[in-house]
Amino acid sequence: MAVTACQGLGFVVSLIGIAGIIAATCMDQWSTQDLYNNPVTAVFNYQGLWRSCVRESSGFTECRGYFTLLGLPAMLQAVRALMIVGIVLGAIGLLVSIFALKCIRIGSMEDSAKANMTLTSGIMFIVSGLCAIAGVSVFANMLVTNFWMSTANMYTGMGGMVQTVQTRYTFGAALFVGWVAGGLTLIGGVMMCIACRGLAPEETNYKAVSYHASGHSVAYKPGGFKASTGFGSNTKNKKIYDGGARTEDEVQSYPSKHDYV
């Protein structure tokens, strides 16, 4: 039950995270005009990964796409790449994890296959989350660098008679969405990896051996221990007796075409 919950929760958290990464990537407010210590202007500038926008006080908003590929800063291209890789990996991870979910039954899929798929999707989510966090962090670092450079220009470029309004940019909403979404995807991935540990069957399946105790006839099956992977100690070892009532979580028999996870 705990495994199913962990896997299900990991899936949901990752789903929310990936949706957030997609939202952040599409958002226009990666950087927004810094209004502090600047004259009040009739326009508000903000920029995304794909276009820059200007909202006038009147409410009129105009956005222009970055129609050049070669003319864009390498850092921006890198951020775009990281976010897209994050989305692609996350989407594939979601697809894989749907089939790996313990609560979904597909034909005669073995537990080991589901465990492997859970682990694969978990790793994909982790990498996806890291890509998003890296992308957002690179962009944030770029903003900080540019902010201080333009601040320096504000105070050194006053020699002439004409002043200019130095448009400085600060963190936009998309950065925070990206960080949170990346974090959620990462957490979801870790949860999937943890769930995988409780899904995989024993590496060694022993043949059933009958032990005859005096007065009672019981069959002891060492292979009946709760499934465990090689990641850690088996904390739920339970002896299974023939003829006893067995719950799904308590028994792990040998896979057959009638077995569903």
Epitope: Y46, Q47, E56, S58, G59, E62, V162, T164, V165
Partner: antibody
Framework: QVQLKESGPGLVAPSQSLSITCTVS????????VHWIRQPPGKGLEWLGV???????NYNSALMSRLSISKDNSKSQVYLKMHSLQTDDTAMYYC???????????WGQGTALTVSS | DIVMTQSPSSLTVTPGEKVTMSCRSS????????????LSWYHQKPGQPPKLLIY???TRDSGVPVRFTGSGSGTDFTLTISSVQAEDLAVYYC?????????FGAGTKLELK
């Protein structure tokens, strides 16, 4: 067709208050900003302030302390209130609409105000 | 506040001639975000409210004759009337519509010779 029409008292005594109404027709006040501009006789134009579609305002810092702009969307009316009037407040008062940036594409005909005892 | 300086203060013209008037701002009206300069041109005839001719420094308002052309960027702007007509005789104002408080130039008066 967008139309703006100002109406005011015409004559006000010094140190008194002023209230001018701008009635807008042909368009909802929730879709654009309305500015107030004045022009003393034989002189240039002076921007007083603006109320935006959402209700936020900007004022001329020189007049901010005695100026207030409000509106009633249901009546399609914008109000300019000014207190402690002096003789140099004598001017033609215009209301105007802005669509792009802060350029004024539609103006009212203006209402003349004389501050005199 | 932004100071808008217009020159000349008055111009005497004959119908059909080309007229140029300039406007200088004490601070740049250029917005890097959309590569636009927020300056407008108006003309005002006696007893009438001003009429918008040009916004964003060079965009003609609807219904404005093509003989009116706005140019310039940043701090220096020009309004050109390619062939002056009798109905163009008016006072021309430039207007900073970028930085609050919004300000107008003192005007250039166009008179008939």
């Amino acid at each position: 067709q967008v139309q703006l029409k100002e109406s005011g008292p015409g004559l006000v005594a010094p140190s008194q208050s002023l209230s001018i109404t701008c009635t807008v027709s042909g368009l909802s006040l929730t879709s654009f900003g309305v500015h107030w501009i004045r022009q003393p006789p034989g002189k240039g134009l002076e921007w007083l302030g603006v109320i935006w579609a959402g209700g936020s305002t900007n004022y001329n810092s020189a007049l901010m302390s005695r100026l207030s702009i409000s509106k009633d969307n249901s009546k399609s009316q914008v109000y300019l209130k000014m207190h402690s009037l002096q003789t140099d407040d004598t001017a033609m008062y215009y209301c105007a609409r802005s669509l792009y940036g802060n350029s004024f594409d539609y103006w009212g005909q203006g209402t003349a105000l004389t501050v005199s005892s | 506040d932004i100071v808008m300086t217009q020159s000349p203060s008055s111009l005497t013209v004959t119908p059909g001639e080309k007229v140029t008037m300039s406007c200088r701002s004490s601070m740049s009206l250029f917005n890097s975000g959309n590569q636009k300069s927020y300056l407008s041109w108006y003309h005002q005839k006696p007893g009438q409210p001003p009429k918008l001719l040009i916004y964003w420094a060079s965009t003609r308002d609807s219904g404005v004759p093509v003989r009116f052309t706005g140019s310039g960027s940043g701090t220096d702007f020009t309004l050109t009337i390619s062939s002056v007509q009798a109905e163009d005789l008016a006072v021309y104002y430039c207007h900073n519509d970028y930085i609050y408080p919004l300000t107008f130039g003192a005007g250039t008066k166009l008179e008939l010779k």
